[in-house]
Amino acid sequence: LNTTILTPNGNEDATTDFFLTSMPTDSLSVSTLPLPEVQCFVFNVEYMNCTWNSSSEPQPTNLTLHYWYKNSDNDKVQKCSHYLFSEEITSGCQLQKKEIHLYQTFVVQLQDPREPRRQATQMLKLQNLVIPWAPENLTLRKLSESQLELNWNNRFLNHCLEHLVQYRTDWDHSWTEQSVDYRHKFSLPSVDGQKRYTFRVRSRFNPLCGSAQHWSEWSHPIHWGSNSSKENPFLFALEA
């Protein structure tokens, strides 16, 4: 087996004349077994967790993680300083705010310390991996006899987030949803005063500052209006 030489700018000089598909699986050596994929999420740009499925290893292995930023002042290889564990085996690494540089290519390398040739290097765009905290402080105010306005706050730069508002009455079997841009307010033009409304909101780091696919958790729900005589099991399930 030829070895792989790692250079800190993320360009691996690798000769690999031997591949997983080139020999029967019963004769695979440990060094050819694929390493688990690393998945990273940046939580509200406060910390980042990069995790892997440690149980996919044929035997318990404390895999090690190194990282650096390509083409930047931060291109020095860093060792993980705060491992996450699953059943006493490394299964992730947590990076703190000062180690997160959203707009530089993040390079992460997972390695089997007992078999150094067994390594995998991935590149990630952290701005697409941001998950904001759930919206907070939902408030409702009446703009007119039949119009409600929902407001909320986010613990992040407001212009970076888009939002999804869901609402339903206690008569509804499903949510109605509405996309909202960075303005973090939503108006419902016609409210039936005889119904009880429930609203909730979630947010996403998209599209102005990143292209994240993952939404935040839902906010705590907020309610408006009188309790209807019709009991709705959906509503109670929501509040449970």
Partner: nanobody
Amino acid sequence: QVQLVESGGGLVQAGGSLRLSCAASGRSLSRDAMGWFRQAPGKEREFVAVMSWGGDTFYTDSVEGRFTFSRDNAKNAVYLEMNDLQPEDTAVYYCAAAPTSFATTAYSSSNSYSYWGRGTQVTVSS
């Protein structure tokens, strides 16, 4: 049986362009990280570019801004548009596929790829 077949290589003058194609059979590439690697005579195989199945694309420093990676899942193919080619780009170019679970997985390590093509020769004359 999985097959990756590269095409589009050839002889070109410095400053010229080529478009490499990699067509797959026996497997859908839609959930694979796809990589391009190259090997020049007497040198080790090196990473050129990678695209995750979520669409994130990365390049080695020396080709950034000159090469463009694209994919067409309907045709089960990926492409490498190479502009402003230089003599140091002369190499055999290989396409590779890595089955991945996550849309963001983009490997730059060649040993992470399970499937490889036989390569296409690119020669840039000065």
